[in-house]
Interface confidence: medium
């Protein structure tokens, strides 16, 4: 008689990342008997929800249920039916919802209520929808990449995860760029973290970690662009804004009401003699870089050293994984290779921004114009943020690794969030039984 294969003893988890520009659903899977091992959880699916971020539904909350349907139905298909009721679902909202909450706590609660209600209708174990803090976003991103890189494991692995992996147990720092905020998280070298708000203590797999983290709200790439436009329009002589961060020949009309809609532009708000203005691209990297630097206040620092806006930042230490929009933008610009120096990146950005808009549209015919038009700004912003904001240098640039996925799992905060909420990262090193790692043999 033929041997029947035993049913897979696996578990699943779902995390929705409700970001400022869009929502993504991630499905994770792991062997049930190895929950406490490091590196066993992997992503089996990512579903990008069609449409904007949930904060944009504030005036049309009744559409949220329909908005989430496709990806939730996809989860129903991917996860075996027998597992549905045991599969936890978490939704974490990030800086887009933090900004909405700053404007109106009750509107933010309303959106979350409707999200919660919509997600509760599926046959999974819905665990709640909440706005995570910037500190959590940074911490969970750091946990994700180090978990996937095997940095928490005391064992020597039989596999090599990524080309740039060093075999030591030094953790990677995490650099995360979203649409509305950016996070920097790492373990400083024997350095006191001078501001308690930026200090995290973890005990993971029997080892203590003193971690620095900060989330810069309004310094995600989309909100940074709004800030830059609001700052520059202040000094425009008329309703034409000649903008070095857009390609020569590019034109776009912006409503002043849209510009001042976000709390991020409040500091630049003024009464303008027009309701609309036109951006006219002039495509100059150097001038764009200069304009971006004006968003970073470096004149004030109450600590031994700061990033910008008076926020403490210890000296950089070790390797860093740069993910989310850091990766997407640099990947588009073909600048993610380990071999590309910072000087080379700057050179390529200068050339890219100077290319005429008509030429760019022809070269990248398949890319939506809204996104395509902003790569010059976004690339320049990434360089400005990393070099002047976080104090990377031409030498330390080689320690930045632009990461999309590690072992098939997206780098980002969602995996770390789920690992934490499902208690899958033990404080102490689990005792290894003779059988528990038999698959490693």
């Amino acid at each position: 008689t033929q041997n029947k294969a035993l049913p897979e003893n696996v578990k699943y988890g779902i995390v929705l990342d409700a970001g400022s520009s869009h929502t993504s659903l991630y499905i994770y899977k792991w062997p049930a008997e190895k929950e406490n091992d490091t590196g066993v959880v992997h992503q089996v699916e990512e579903c990008r929800v069609k449409g904007p971020g949930i904060s944009k539904f504030v005036q049309k909350v009744n559409e949220i249920g329909i908005y989430l349907t496709d990806c939730m139905e996809r989860a129903r298909e991917v996860i075996p039916r027998s597992q549905h009721q045991e599969t936890p679902v978490y939704l974490g909202a990030t800086a887009g919802m933090r900004l909405l909450r700053m404007e109106s706590e009750e509107l933010a609660d309303r959106v979350l209520d409707v999200v919660e209600r919509s997600l509760s209708n599926y046959p999974f174990d819905f665990q709640g929808a909440r706005i995570i803090t910037g500190q959590e976003e940074g911490a969970y991103g750091w946990i994700t990449i180090n978990y996937l890189l095997g940095k928490f494991s005391q064992k020597t692995r039989w596999f090599s995860i990524v080309p740039y992996e060093t075999n030591n147990q030094e953790t990677f720092g995490a650099l995360d760029l979203g649409g509305a905020s950016t996070q920097v998280t790492f373990v400083p070298q024997n350095q006191t973290i001078e501001s308690p708000d930026n200090a995290l203590q973890f005990r993971l797999y029997g080892k203590d970690y003193n971690v620095y983290t900060h989330s810069f709200l309004c310094y995600g790439k989309d909100q940074a662009l709004w800030q830059k436009l609001a700052k520059d329009i202040q000094v425009a002589s008329n309703e034409i804004l000649r903008d070095p961060c857009f390609h020569p020949g590019y034109k776009k009309v912006v409503n002043v009401s849209d510009l001042y809609k976000t709390p991020c532009t409040k500091r630049f708000e003024m009464t303008l003699p027009f309701q609309q203005f036109e951006i006219q691209g002039i495509g100059n990297y150097q001038q764009c870089h200069q304009s971006i630097l004006e968003l970073f206040n470096t004149s004030y620092c109450p600590y031994s050293q700061c990033a910008f806006n008076g926020i403490f930042l210890p000296p950089l230490q070790g390797d860093f994984g740069a993910f989310s929009a850091f990766y997407f933008v640099m990947k588009f610009l073909n600048l993610t290779s380990e071999k590309v120096s910072q000087e080379k990146v700057t050179e390529m950005m200068k050339k890219f921004c100077a290319q005429p808009w008509e030429e760019i549209k022809t070269s990248y015919a398949g890319v939506k114009e809204k996104y395509l038009s902003e790569y010059c700004f976004s690339g320049t912003y990434i360089l400005s943020l990393l070099l002047q904001g976080y104090h990377f240098t031409a030498d330390s640039w080689e320690h930045i690794h632009f990461i999309g996925k590690i072992q098939g799992s997206d780098a980002g905060w969602t995996l770390g969030y789920m690992l934490n909420l499902t208690n899958m990262i033990p404080a102490e090193q689990p005792l290894s039984t003779p059988l528990s790692h038999s698959t490693y043999v």
């Epitope: 249920g65 309303r110 209600r117 599926y122």
Partner: antibody, heavy 122, light 107 residues
């Protein structure tokens, strides 16, 4: 027509538990949420919690969180409310009420059960 | 939680009178309010939802209005069968809350 029919009156001793049922008919059970609302003698209405029959997901009023358990049996279109560790101030009429599920403007209670009187007395 | 302050707690009126009950929410509830009628020994009955939408079969003498935090329920011409307790319900937030009720009596 759409109906919610609840189980009969109960008399319980303090410390005991009570389980009230609510059988739905005339509509698709999983297309509406079921809420439980109670009304103490001469008092107003107070919601206790709700359950999504399609998934079994629940949300409880903090006041009852550790004592109330809501469940459903979709095969017989019935919702249940169990209240444990009963006290004399739990003497009340307990109602089930359905609420629209999908659009936020349909969340009101449009159909109610007839109510179940629970008396807690030693 | 959103608090609903209903007033008056009781009122006495004559047949044919215009009767008004108000509910004030502790925050903007975006018109997500319903009005219920409850007669002794009976379950509440929905009369109006979304501030002013009359349920099918409910007489047109019942109406509702309001926005933001302030809402009004009106019986344009009181009938003997309208003697009951009336409650408002906010369903703007998932944690629904009722007003304390208004007991309506005939003079």
């Amino acid at each position: 027509q759409v109906q919610l029919v609840q189980s009969g009156a109960e008399v319980k001793k303090p410390g005991a538990s009570v389980k009230v049922s609510c059988k739905a008919s005339g509509y698709t059970f999983t297309n509406y949420w079921m809420y439980w609302v109670r009304q103490a003698p001469g008092q107003g209405l107070e919601w206790m919690g709700r359950i999504a029959p399609s998934s079994g997901a629940t949300k409880y009023n903090e006041k009852f969180k550790n004592r109330v358990t809501l469940t459903v049996d979709t095969s017989i279109s019935t919702a249940y409310m169990e209240l444990s560790r009963l006290r004399s101030d739990d003497t009340a009429v307990y109602y089930c009420a359905r609420s629209g599920i999908y659009y936020d403007y349909d969340w009101f209670f449009d159909v109610w059960g007839q109510g179940t009187t629970v008396t807690v007395s030693s | 939680d959103i608090q609903m302050t209903q007033s008056p707690s009781s009122l006495s009126a004559s047949v044919g009178d215009r009767v008004t009950i108000t509910c004030k929410a502790s925050q903007d509830i975006n018109k997500y309010i319903g009005w219920y009628q409850q007669k002794p020994g009976k379950a509440p009955k929905l009369l109006i939802h979304y501030t002013s939408t009359l349920q099918p079969g409910v007489p047109s003498r019942f109406s509702g209005s309001g926005s933001g935090r302030d809402y009004t329920f009106t019986i344009s011409s009181l009938q003997p069968e309208d003697i009951a307790t009336y409650y408002c319900l906010q369903y703007h937030a998932l944690l629904f809350t009722f007003g304390q009720g208004t007991k309506l009596e005939i003079k």
